[in-house]
Interface confidence: low
C-alpha cells in the first residue's frame, strides 16, 4: 500500500489517499483495488496506463486536484470502471477524445468544473452504459453534432453554467433514455426546431437564465414525458411570434415556471402564460 494511503479489503478492496498533498499518482497501488480515492491532492498529470494493473477497478475519484493533463491512455484496461470523478480540476481545459474509450461499463462521469472549452469529436464514443454525465460549470461554447450519440442509456445530462449559445439540430441525438436535461445559466439564444427530437422520455428541462427571445414549439413537440419546465429569466419577446408558445403553455399539464416578457415594453414583466391571445400583437 502506498505510504500516503490507507488500504483495506472490506466492503470492497480500497486504496484511499485523499487530501495527502500528493503531486503524482502514487506507485504501488494494489492491483486488486476496486476503489481508488485520490481526491483533494495536488496531482497535475495522469500518465498513460496509470491504473492498468487494477483490472477490477470500479470507482476512481480524482476530483479536486490540479489536473492539467490526462494522457489519452490514462485509463486503459479499466473495463470494469463504473464511476469516474474528474471534477473540480479547473486547469484541465481539454480532454483527448480517446481518453474514455474502452470504458464500456462506466455509468457515472464527472467532468464538471474542469475549465473545459470544447468537447472533442468522439469524446463519449462507446460509453453505452453511461447514465449520469456532469458537464456543468465549464466554459463550453458549443454542442457539436452527435456528441452524445452513443449514450442511449444516459438519464441525466448536466450542462448548466457554461457559455453555450445555441442548441443545434443534432446536439442531443441518441439520448433516448434522457430524463433530466439542465441547460440553465448559459447563453442560449436559439434552439433548433428538431433539437429535442430523440428526447421522448425527458421529464425535466431547465432553460432558465439564458438569452432566449423565442422558442419554437416544434422543438417541444417530441417531449412526450415532460413534467417540469423552467423558462424564466430569458428576454422573451411577447408579440405575435410568441402565439404558438403561448398556446402550447396553455395546454401543458406539467409544472412550468413563469415566462416573463421583456418586450414589447407594455408587456414587460408580465407572464406570457397569463396573457390573452390578443395581447400578442404586432408582426
Amino acid at each position: 500500500c502506498p505510504g500516503a494511503c490507507v488500504c483495506y479489503n472490506e466492503p470492497k478492496v480500497t486504496t484511499s489517499c485523499p487530501q495527502q498533498g500528493l503531486q503524482a499518482v502514487p506507485v504501488g497501488i494494489p492491483a486488486a483495488s476496486q476503489r481508488i480515492f485520490l481526491h483533494g491532492n495536488r496531482i497535475s498529470h495522469v500518465p498513460a496506463a496509470s491504473f492498468r494493473a487494477c483490472r477490477n477497478l470500479t470507482i476512481l475519484w480524482l476530483h479536486s486536484n490540479v489536473l492539467a493533463r490526462i494522457d489519452a491512455a490514462a485509463f486503459t484496461g479499466l473495463a470494469l470502471l463504473e464511476q469516474l470523478d474528474l471534477s473540480d480540476n479547473a486547469q484541465l481545459r481539454s480532454v483527448d477524445p480517446a481518453t474514455f474509450h474502452g470504458l464500456g461499463r462506466l455509468h457515472t462521469l464527472h467532468l464538471d468544473r474542469c475549465g473545459l472549452q470544447e468537447l472533442g469529436p468522439g469524446l463519449f464514443r462507446g460509453l453505452a452504459a453511461l447514465q449520469y454525465l456532469y458537464l456543468q460549470d465549464n466554459a463550453l461554447q458549443a454542442l457539436p453534432d452527435d456528441t452524445f450519440r452513443d449514450l442511449g442509456n444516459l438519464t441525466h445530462l448536466f450542462l448548466h453554467g457554461n457559455r453555450i449559445s445555441s442548441v443545434p439540430e443534432r446536439a442531443f441525438r441518441g439520448l433516448h433514455s434522457l430524463d433530466r436535461l439542465l441547460l440553465h445559466q448559459n447563453r442560449v439564444a436559439h434552439v433548433h426546431p428538431h433539437a429535442f427530437r430523440d428526447l421522448g422520455r425527458l421529464m425535466t428541462l431547465y432553460l432558465f437564465a439564458n438569452n432566449l427571445s423565442a422558442l419554437p414549439t416544434e422543438a417541444l413537440a417530441p417531449l412526450r414525458a415532460l413534467q417540469y419546465l423552467r423558462l424564466n429569466d430569458n428576454p422573451w419577446v411577447c408579440d405575435c411570434r410568441a402565439r404558438p408558445l403561448w398556446a402550447w403553455l396553455q395546454k401543458f399539464r406539467g409544472s412550468s415556471s413563469e415566462v416573463p416578457c421583456s418586450l414589447p415594453q407594455r408587456l414587460a414583466g408580465r407572464d406570457l402564460k397569463r396573457l390573452a391571445a390578443n395581447d400578442l400583437q404586432g408582426c
Epitope: M203, A221, L223, A225, P244, A247, K251, G254, S255
Partner: antibody
Framework: EVQLLESGGGLVQPGGSLRLSCAAS????????MSWVRQAPGKGLEWVSA????????YYADSVKGRFTISRDNSKNTLYLQMNSLRAEDTAVYYC???????????????WGRGTLVTVSS | QSVLTQPPSVSGAPGQGVSISCTGT?????????VQWYQQFPGTAPKLLIY???RRPSGVPERFSGSKSGTSASLAITGLRTEDEADYYC???????????FGGGTKLTVL
C-alpha cells in the same frame, strides 16, 4: 405490448357510486399523463378528466366537476376514476387513454383501452 | 352539443377521395391548438389517425392526411377502401373551457 385495460363498469342506480380502474402495461406509466374519455350509446366522444404523470395535477370537464375524482397509483401502473352522484346522462362506455402527444402532458390520445360500460338506471 | 363541428356523414366510392371538415373557433383551432383525428369502428375503441394537425403515427397509411387553416381543419382520405368505413372524430383544445374538445363525429360510408 402497450396496453390499457379498463374494469369496474356495471349497472348503478342514480345517485350511486362506481370506481373504474385502468391497468396499464408495456410502457413507463409514470411518464405519461392519462385521461378518461366517454361515449354515450350512439353518440360522440366526450373528454371527462385528465391527470398528470406524477398525479400532482388533475383536470375535469364541467359536466363531472365535483362528482368525479381521477387518481393514479404509479406503483401499480393503474389509473382510477371515482364516480359519485351518478346521473342517467353519465351512462356511457368509459375509455382510458394515454396522452402521448406534445410533451406527453397534453391532448394527443395515442393509446386507448377497450372501454367499460357504465349504465345509470333505476 | 359538440364544440367542434363536423358533418354527420360523408360518402364516396372505392378508389375516390373524400374530405371531412372540422370547424372550431378562435379559442380552439383558431388559437393555434393542434388538431387530432381518430378513427372508430363500431364496438371498438378509437384509434389515433392524425396528430399535430398533419402528422401520421407509424402504421397509418399515407392515404390519410390532415391540414389546418384558420379556425378549421380537415381530414382527407384518398383511394377509398371499404375498410375505411368508420366514424371519424376531430379533437383539439379549448382555451376558454380549459378542456379537450371533440367534434361530433362523421360517419364515412364507402358506397
Amino acid at each position: 405490448e402497450v396496453q390499457l385495460l379498463e374494469s369496474g363498469g356495471g349497472l348503478v342506480q342514480p345517485g350511486g357510486s362506481l370506481r373504474l380502474s385502468c391497468a396499464a402495461s408495456g410502457f413507463t406509466f409514470s411518464s405519461y399523463a392519462m385521461s378518461w374519455v366517454r361515449q354515450a350509446p350512439g353518440k360522440g366522444l366526450e373528454w371527462v378528466s385528465a391527470i398528470s404523470g406524477s398525479g400532482g395535477s388533475t383536470y375535469y370537464a364541467d359536466s363531472v366537476k365535483g362528482r368525479f375524482t381521477i387518481s393514479r397509483d404509479n406503483s401499480k401502473n393503474t389509473l382510477y376514476l371515482q364516480m359519485n352522484s351518478l346521473r342517467a346522462e353519465d351512462t356511457a362506455v368509459y375509455y382510458c387513454a394515454r396522452e402521448g402527444g406534445i410533451l406527453g402532458a397534453v391532448d394527443v390520445f395515442d393509446i386507448w383501452g377497450r372501454g367499460t360500460l357504465v349504465t345509470v338506471s333505476s | 352539443q359538440s364544440v367542434l363541428t363536423q358533418p354527420p356523414s360523408v360518402s364516396g366510392a372505392p378508389g375516390q377521395g373524400v374530405s371531412i371538415s372540422c370547424t372550431g373557433t378562435t379559442s380552439d383551432i383558431g388559437a393555434g391548438y393542434t388538431v387530432q383525428w381518430y378513427q372508430q369502428f363500431p364496438g371498438t375503441a378509437p384509434k389515433l389517425l392524425i396528430y399535430d394537425d398533419y402528422r401520421r403515427p407509424s402504421g397509418v397509411p399515407e392515404r390519410f392526411s390532415g391540414s389546418k387553416s384558420g379556425t378549421s381543419a380537415s381530414l382527407a382520405i384518398t383511394g377509398l377502401r371499404t375498410e375505411d368505413e368508420a366514424d371519424y372524430y376531430c379533437q383539439s383544445y379549448d382555451n376558454s373551457l380549459k378542456n379537450v374538445v371533440f367534434g361530433g363525429g362523421t360517419k364515412l360510408t364507402v358506397l
